[in-house]
Interface confidence: medium
C-alpha cells in the first residue's frame, strides 16, 4: 500500500529561521512541509493539523501551540487551538488564517502541517427499498465462535443502539467530533443520521445478519447526518481509541473505518501508530472507481483496505462510479445489496452497497479469527485473510488495464476452521508505487515490520528496466527496482512472508565476464535459497542465454545474465526447506507460469533469461508469472524462449508446532 509517495499536493516552504522572538529555533537545515488535499472541493482551509516531531512531549506541544498564538497575535491574527494531540501523534489542531503558515512552519519541533479536509461515508445509496425477508435463512450461517473475545470500534455516524440487531452489543461512547451539516434547510432526522453506522454495526455483529455475531462494538461519531466528517475529527477519534486502550487494556481490538477522504499524510501516520500499538484497522477502499492509493486511510500500508464485489464476485458498480482498486487494496469482500439493520425502526432491515459494507464484512471476519487466536499479530491476520480468500474469481476486465496486475484478485472468506492454520508458511505479494519515467527512477516495495522479505522482482510495461535488488534500509531488507533510459517506469514486487526465527541475508555476485553467465548460491550452513534477483547497469541486456538447467545437486543457486549482478536471498529458519521449480517455453509466449504444489508456498519468482523483451516477473498467490513483450511487436523469435523460475518453500517446524497444539 501507499508509503511516502502519495499523489497529494505538497508545498514545501523551505524557510530560513528568523529570530522573531523564538526561544528555540528549528534544527539547522531542516524544513517543515505543508500538505493539503489534492481534491479541491474536499479541502477545509482555515483549519490545520500541526504535526510535531516524533519525540516531542505534550508539554512541548502545548508550548509550541501557545507560541504560535502569541506570534500570530503580534501580527494581528486571531488563532484558536482546537485540540492538542498526544497518545498517537504529537501536535495540535489550530484554526487560523492561511497567512500564518509560513510562521507556523518555522516553529520548533514542527515536522509538517496538513490542512484539514473532508472524509465521507462509503455507502451508496443510504436507503434503498426495505427488504424482507433477507435473502438467506438465518440458520444457514452459524459460525462456531462469533468473535466474543474481540472489541470492534466503529468510527462512523451516530447509530440506533436499540435496534434489535445490535441492542446490547454496541456501546455508544460519548465521543463525537463532526462538522456542521451543509445547507441552511437541512433537517436532522434521527433515522437518516443513524443510517450508515447502524447498518455497518449490523453487518459486523448483528444477531440475524451479522458476520461476527458474538463481537461487542463501541461506536464513535465522526460522520455527521450527511455522512461527512473531517480528517481532524477522525484523528481525534483514533487518539480516543488509543487512550481507551491504554487506560483499560482489553483483548484484541479491531477498528473499522468505513470512510474515505483524499490522500492524507497525517491520517495515514495516525493509522500506522495505532497499528503498531497492536490494533487491527480495517477500512473502505473508497467508492470512486479510482486508485485506492489516492485516498486515506485506504492508502495507509498498515491498514487492511477492502474493495467491494457483488454476489457474482464482480467489482461493484455504484452509479457512475464503483469500488476503488489497485495495489493499496488488500482484498475484496461483498459490498452490493448487503442486508443489515435499518435505522427506520428497531426491527427494520435495509440493503446498502459500498466499500463500507465490504470493510464491515472483513472487520467481522477479523473479529472471529482474533477471537479464535487472540495472539495473532496484524501481519499474521492479514496473511490469513489473504490465504483463506477465494482466489482469481474477480473479472479483472472491469479494472483499468494498467491496474489489473496491481489489484489483488481475492474475495474475503471465513476460514473453514478458525484453528489449525498455524502450520502454513504464509506469503503475500506487495507492489511498490510506480517509479516514474526518469532515467534513474527507482521504486521500493517494503514488507510489514514482522514479515520477512524472501524475494524481490520487478516489472515494467515497456520492458525497459534494469532489474531489481534487495538492499538493507533502516535495519530491514527492501526490494528496489530500477528504471532504464526510455522506460515508462517500473514496479518493485516484494514477496513478504511470515517466517518465525528467520535469519535472512542477501548474497551478491557481480557481473561475470565469462560466457557462462553469473551465478550465486547460499553457502552458509543451513541456509536455503528463497529468491533470486538480478540487476544490471547496462541499458539493454544482450540476447545471451545462460544455461537454464542448474547442475544437479545445486538447488541453492541463482543463475543470471553475464552482464547482470545476481542477488540470492538466503534464509535460515527452523525446519525451512525450499526447492526450485522451472517452466520453460521454447516458443515465444506473452506469459509463462509455474506454480508450487499443495503444501508448498511460493517465496521466489524470477525469469530466465533476464533479457530486455522480458517485462518482468511477479507472484500471484502461489503462481509465478513471467510476462514478455508481445512477440508480434518485437518481430524476433530468436529470443522468445522464456523460463519462469519459482522457489517453493515449506516449514516442517511450523507443521510440527501445529500438530503439537492439536
Amino acid at each position: 500500500q501507499e508509503d511516502e509517495d502519495g499523489d497529494y499536493e505538497e508545498l514545501v516552504l523551505a524557510l530560513r529561521s528568523e529570530e522573531d522572538g523564538l526561544a528555540e529555533a528549528p534544527e539547522h537545515g531542516t524544513t517543515a512541509t505543508f500538505h493539503r488535499c489534492a481534491k479541491d472541493p474536499w479541502r477545509l482551509p482555515g483549519t490545520y493539523v500541526v504535526v510535531l516531531k516524533e519525540e516531542t512531549h505534550l508539554s512541548q506541544s502545548e508550548r509550541t501551540a501557545r507560541r504560535l498564538q502569541a506570534q500570530a497575535a503580534r501580527r494581528g491574527y486571531l488563532t484558536k487551538i482546537l485540540h492538542v494531540f498526544h497518545g498517537l501523534l504529537p501536535g495540535f489542531l489550530v484554526k487560523m488564517s492561511g497567512d500564518l503558515l509560513e510562521l507556523a512552519l518555522k516553529l520548533p519541533h514542527v515536522d509538517y502541517i496538513e490542512e484539514d479536509s473532508s472524509v465521507f461515508a462509503q455507502s451508496i445509496p443510504w436507503n434503498l427499498e426495505r427488504i424482507t425477508p433477507p435473502r438467506y435463512r438465518a440458520d444457514e450461517y452459524q459460525p462456531p465462535d462469533g468473535g466474543s473475545l474481540v472489541e470492534v470500534y466503529l468510527l462512523d455516524t451516530s447509530i440506533q443502539s436499540d435496534h434489535r440487531e445490535i441492542e446490547g452489543r454496541v456501546m455508544v461512547t460519548d465521543f463525537e467530533n463532526v462538522p456542521e451539516e451543509d445547507g441552511t434547510r437541512f433537517h436532522r432526522q434521527a433515522s437518516k443520521c443513524d443510517s450508515h453506522g447502524t447498518h455497518l454495526a449490523g453487518v459486523v455483529s448483528g444477531r440475524d445478519a451479522g458476520v461476527a455475531k458474538g463481537a461487542s462494538m463501541r461506536s464513535l461519531r465522526v460522520l455527521n447526518c450527511q455522512g461527512k466528517g473531517t480528517v481532524s475529527g477522525t484523528l481525534i477519534g483514533l487518539e480516543f481509541i488509543r487512550k481507551s486502550q491504554l487506560v483499560q487494556p482489553v483483548g484484541p481490538l479491531v477498528v473499522l473505518l468505513p470512510l474515505a477522504g483524499g490522500y492524507s499524510r497525517v491520517l495515514n501516520a495516525a493509522c500506522q501508530r495505532l497499528a503498531r500499538a497492536g490494533v487491527v484497522l480495517v477500512t473502505a477502499a473508497g467508492n470512486f472507481r479510482d486508485d485506492a492509493c489516492l485516498y486515506s486511510p485506504a492508502s495507509a500500508p498498515e491498514v487492511i483496505t477492502v474493495g467491494a464485489t457483488n454476489a457474482q464476485d464482480q467489482p461493484v458498480t455504484l452509479g457512475t462510479l464503483g469500488t476503488n482498486f489497485g495495489r493499496c487494496v488488500d482484498l475484496f469482500a461483498p459490498g452490493e445489496d448487503i442486508i443489515g439493520a435499518s435505522s427506520d425502526c428497531s426491527t427494520c432491515f435495509v440493503s446498502q452497497s459500498g466499500t463500507s459494507q465490504a470493510a464491515a464484512h472483513v472487520a467481522g471476519i477479523a473479529a472471529m479469527m482474533l477471537s479464535a487466536e487472540p495472539e495473532l499479530t496484524l501481519a499474521e491476520l492479514r496473511q490469513r485473510l489473504i490465504h483463506f480468500s477465494a482466489k482469481d474469481v474477480i473479472n479483472e476486465a472491469w479494472f483499468p488495464e494498467d491496474q489489473r496486475v496491481l489489484t489483488p484478485n481475492l474475495v474475503a472468506a471465513l476460514p473453514p476452521s478458525t484453528h489449525g492454520a498455524g502450520w502454513q508458511l504464509f506469503c503475500r505479494t506487495v507492489w511498490s508505487a510506480h517509479s516514474g519515467p526518469t532515467r534513474m527512477a527507482t521504486a521500493v516495495a517494503r514488507c510489514a515490520p514482522d514479515e520477512e522479505l524472501l524475494s524481490c522482482s520487478s516489472f515494467s510495461r515497456s520492458g525497459k528496466r534494469r532489474g531489481e535488488r534487495m538492499e538493507a534500509q533502516g535495519g530491514k531488507l527492501v526490494c528496489r527496482a530500477h528504471n532504464a533510459f526510455g522506460g515508462e517506469g517500473v514496479y518493485a514486487i516484494a514477496r513478504c512472508c511470515l517466517l518465525p526465527q528467520a535469519n535472512c541475508s542477501v548474497h551478491t555476485a557481480p557481473p561475470a565476464e565469462a560466457s557462462m553467465g553469473t551465478r550465486v548460491h547460499c553457502h552458509q550452513q543451513g541456509h536455503v535459497l528463497t529468491g533470486c534477483s538480478s540487476h544490471w547497469e547496462v541499458e539493454d541486456l544482450g540476447t545471451h542465454k545462460p544455461p537454464v538447467l542448474r547442475p544437479r545437486g545445486q538447488p541453492n543457486q541463482c543463475v543470471g545474465h553475464r552482464e547482470a549482478s545476481i542477488h540470492a536471498s538466503c534464509c535460515h529458519a527452523p525446519g525451512l526447506e525450499c526447492k526450485v521449480k522451472e517452466h520453460g517455453i521454447p516458443a515465444p509466449q506473452e506469459q509463462v507460469t509455474v506454480a508450487c504444489e499443495e503444501g508448498w508456498t511460493l517465496t521466489g519468482c524470477s525469469a530466465l533469461p533476464g533479457t530486455s523483451h522480458v517485462l518482468g516477473a511477479y507472484a500471484v498467490d502461489n503462481t509465478c508469472v513471467v510476462r514478455s513483450r508481445d512477440v508480434s511487436t518485437t518481430g524476433s523469435t530468436s529470443e522468445g524462449a522464456v523460463t519462469a523460475v519459482a522457489i517453493c518453500c515449506r516449514s516442517r517446524h511450523l507443521a510440527q508446532a501445529s500438530q503439537e497444539l492439536q
Epitope: 438465518a138 440458520d139 452459524q142 434489535r164 446490547g168 444477531r207 440475524d208 432491515f349
Partner: antibody, heavy 118, light 108 residues
Framework: EVQLLESGGGLVQPGGSLRLSCKAS????????INWVRQAPGKGLEWIGR????????RYNEKFKGKATISRDNSKNTLYLQMNSLRAEDTAVYYC???????????WGQGTLVTVSS | EIVLTQSPATLSLSPGERATITCRAS??????LNWYQQKPGQAPRLLIY???NRATGIPARFSGSGSGTDFTLTISSLEPEDFAVYYC??????????FGGGTKVEIK
C-alpha cells in the same frame, strides 16, 4: 450464582398503587437489562417494560405507559416497578427477568403476587 | 404489532414420545425467537434463544428450528419433568417483547 428476588406484592385496593422491588445479585448489575413481566391467573405472559441499569434508559409496552414506572438504585443493585391506578385486571404474578442478549430472558425472579380487590 | 400463534394449544402425549410445538409470527422476525418452559407455581425458564440455540443447562432433547415466520420447538423424547406449558417469545419493535399464547404439554 445469579439471583433475582422480588418483593412488595400483596393485596391492593382498586385505584391504589404499589411499588415492587427486584434485588439482583451474583453478576455485574449494570451490564444486563432487567424486564418486568406479569401473568394473570391461568393466562399467558405479558411484557410490561425494561430498564438498562447502566444508563437508566427505559422502554415500555404502550399498554403500560403512564401506568407503570421502572427505576433502579445501583447502590442497592435493586430495580423497582411502580404501578398506579390499579384495577382488578391488574391482578397477576409479577416477575422481574434479566435480559441476557437483547430480549431473551435467562434468569427470572420467583414472582410476587399482586391482588387488586376491595 | 406482531402476533405469535402457537399450536396446538394442548398436546397430550406419553413419556418417551416426541413433542413438536409450532409458533407462527404474523410477520418476518428473522431468528429473534425464544422458547420458555413454565411449570405450575414456578417462573418461566429459558430453553432456546435466537430460534435454535440451547440455553445453558438445557438437555439436548430440546431443540429449536426455523427462521422468518415459522418456528418449531421439538422435544425428542418426553421425560416426566417435561410436562409443562411452553411459550414462544419474539423481539419486535412495538412492543419490543411479545409472547405466544402458550402450549400445554400434558400426560395422556
Amino acid at each position: 450464582e445469579v439471583q433475582l428476588l422480588e418483593s412488595g406484592g400483596g393485596l391492593v385496593q382498586p385505584g391504589g398503587s404499589l411499588r415492587l422491588s427486584c434485588k439482583a445479585s451474583g453478576y455485574t448489575f449494570s451490564r444486563y437489562g432487567i424486564n418486568w413481566v406479569r401473568q394473570a391467573p391461568g393466562k399467558g405472559l405479558e411484557w410490561i417494560g425494561r430498564i438498562d441499569p447502566g444508563n437508566g434508559g427505559t422502554r415500555y409496552n404502550e399498554k403500560f405507559k403512564g401506568k407503570a414506572t421502572i427505576s433502579r438504585d445501583n447502590s442497592k443493585n435493586t430495580l423497582y416497578l411502580q404501578m398506579n391506578s390499579l384495577r382488578a385486571e391488574d391482578t397477576a404474578v409479577y416477575y422481574c427477568a434479566r435480559a441476557n442478549d437483547g430480549y431473551s430472558f435467562d434468569y427470572w425472579g420467583q414472582g410476587t403476587l399482586v391482588t387488586v380487590s376491595s | 404489532e406482531i402476533v405469535l400463534t402457537q399450536s396446538p394449544a394442548t398436546l397430550s402425549l406419553s413419556p418417551g414420545e416426541r413433542a413438536t410445538i409450532t409458533c407462527r409470527a404474523s410477520q418476518y422476525v428473522g431468528s429473534y425467537l425464544n422458547w420458555y418452559q413454565q411449570k405450575p407455581g414456578q417462573a418461566p425458564r429459558l430453553l432456546i434463544y435466537d430460534a435454535s440455540n440451547r440455553a445453558t443447562g438445557i438437555p439436548a432433547r430440546f431443540s429449536g428450528s426455523g427462521s422468518g415466520t415459522d418456528f418449531t420447538l421439538t422435544i425428542s423424547s418426553l421425560e416426566p419433568e417435561d410436562f409443562a406449558v411452553y411459550y414462544c417469545q419474539v423481539w419486535d419493535s412495538s412492543p419490543p417483547v411479545v409472547f405466544g399464547g402458550g402450549t400445554k404439554v400434558e400426560i395422556k
